[in-house]
Interface confidence: medium
């Protein structure tokens, strides 16, 4: 029961956080003019990964898409590639987890193979999260820089006859959405990996040692025999002389060149 | 609303220099790009250099990098195209535009002019071989 509800609450938390990403992948606000020392103005900038916009005192707003420039900076692109990895790990996690749920039947899908989703998807999630915070955290640094940057340079008055008046750029709201989906992410895919331990069956059946007898003459079969805890389903192998009688583990063994001596 | 007016235009050999003016009123705080673009004789308009409000490297199309240089006086509202080594080629009616739009993090400013709201009336340079 705790397995179930540790699997299920992962897949809920990765799926508000995938959310979380995709909203924040697609925000304007990823950086906001700093009002610091302009707090009334008649426009009001801000920019996405995508486009930048103006929102002018009467409430109008304009946005102009990226596509319409002359370059963009590697790591803005790079940005944008991690946050659509985020996504699309994301996404491929969540349709896997869904298979995975032991709420869920599917035909008669084992144990074995529904711990196995739980994992690949805890671990896809994980890394989606870690994609997204990367991302976020990569653009919060470039922000940083120029924001220290124009600070310096509207003291100075560096480089001659360019501008001294910085307009400045601080963390827009989509930082935030993307750190906090982010982690939510990779929490959802952790739990999905512990929950990954609990839906593992604790020990498999594997084909045992049998013997056949055939007169004087025992035949011996070396098989896939694991050393198991000794408890449970492994103590139906036992040894059998009548005369070619076999356990239930040696009905689904095929006939090999070791079976008849 | 921002008004632009341009000064510097004239004639000049091939091989000499000149400095065009852009002087910015109005409410210059919409102006955060800011670009020199020209049309010769039976030509489209093209951009020749943008830059940006804030601390961004300017934009220089091919055909005029390491000859023009493009600057800003935020103080005075002024946009300064300094163009040395001209050719017979750089004849054109110069005219200075203003975007109010920004890019953060290096994006250069953009070079299509449906983008930029507002207009100087534009000054002519000829260049004689």
């Known amino acids: 029961m705790a397995v179930t509800a540790c699997q299920g609450l992962g897949f809920v938390v990765s799926l508000i956080g995938i959310a979380g990403i995709i909203a924040a992948t697609c925000m304007d606000q990823w950086s906001t003019q700093d009002l610091y020392n302009n707090p009334v103005t008649a426009v009001f900038n801000y920019q996405g990964l995508w486009r930048s916009c103006v929102r002018e005192s009467s409430g109008f707003t304009e946005c102009r898409g990226y596509f319409t420039l002359l370059g963009l900076p590697a790591m803005l692109q790079a940005v944008r590639a991690l946050m659509i990895v985020g996504i699309v790990l994301g996404a491929i996690g969540l349709l896997v987890s869904i298979f995975a749920l032991k709420c869920i039947r599917i035909g008669s899908m084992e144990d074995s193979a529904k711990a196995n989703m739980t994992l690949t998807s805890g671990i896809m999630f994980i890394v989606s999260g870690l994609c997204a915070i990367a991302g976020v955290s990569v653009f919060a640094n470039m922000l940083v820089t120029n924001f220290w940057m124009s600070t310096a340079n509207m003291y100075t008055g560096m480089g001659g006859m360019v501008q001294t008046v910085q307009t400045r750029y601080t963390f827009g709201a989509a930082l935030f959405v993307g750190w906090v989906a982010g982690g939510l992410t990779l929490i959802g895919g952790v739990m999905m990996c512990i929950a990954c331990r609990g839906l593992a069956p604790e020990e498999t059946n594997y084909k045992a040692v049998s013997y056949h007898a055939s007169g004087h003459s025992v035949a011996y079969k070396p098989g896939g025999f694991k050393a198991s805890t000794g408890f449970g389903s492994n103590t139906k192998n036992k040894k059998i002389y009548d005369g070619g009688a076999r356990t239930e583990d040696e009905v689904q063994s095929y006939p090999s060149k070791h079976d008849y001596v | 609303q921002v008004q632009l007016v341009e000064s510097g235009g004239g004639s000049v050999q091939a091989g000499g220099s000149l400095s065009l003016s852009c002087a910015a009123s109005?409410?210059?705080?919409?102006?955060?790009?800011m670009a020199w673009f020209r049309q010769g004789p039976g030509k489209e308009r093209e951009v020749v250099a943008t830059?940006?409000?804030?601390?961004?490297?300017?934009y220089y199309t091919d055909s005029v990098k390491g000859r023009f240089t493009i600057s800003r006086d935020a103080d005075k509202n002024r946009v300064y195209l300094q163009m040395d080594s001209l050719k017979p080629e750089d004849t054109a009616m110069y005219y200075c535009?203003?975007?109010?739009?920004?890019?953060?993090?290096?994006?250069?400013?953009?070079?299509?002019?449906?983008?930029?709201?507002?207009w100087g009336q534009g000054t002519r340079v000829t260049v004689s071989s």
């Open positions: 109005g409410d210059t705080f919409h102006s955060k790009c």
């Open positions: 535009a203003a975007d109010r739009f920004t890019y953060p993090y290096g994006v250069i400013c953009g070079g299509i002019s449906a983008n930029y709201r507002y």
């Open positions: 830059i940006q409000s804030g601390y961004y490297r300017p």
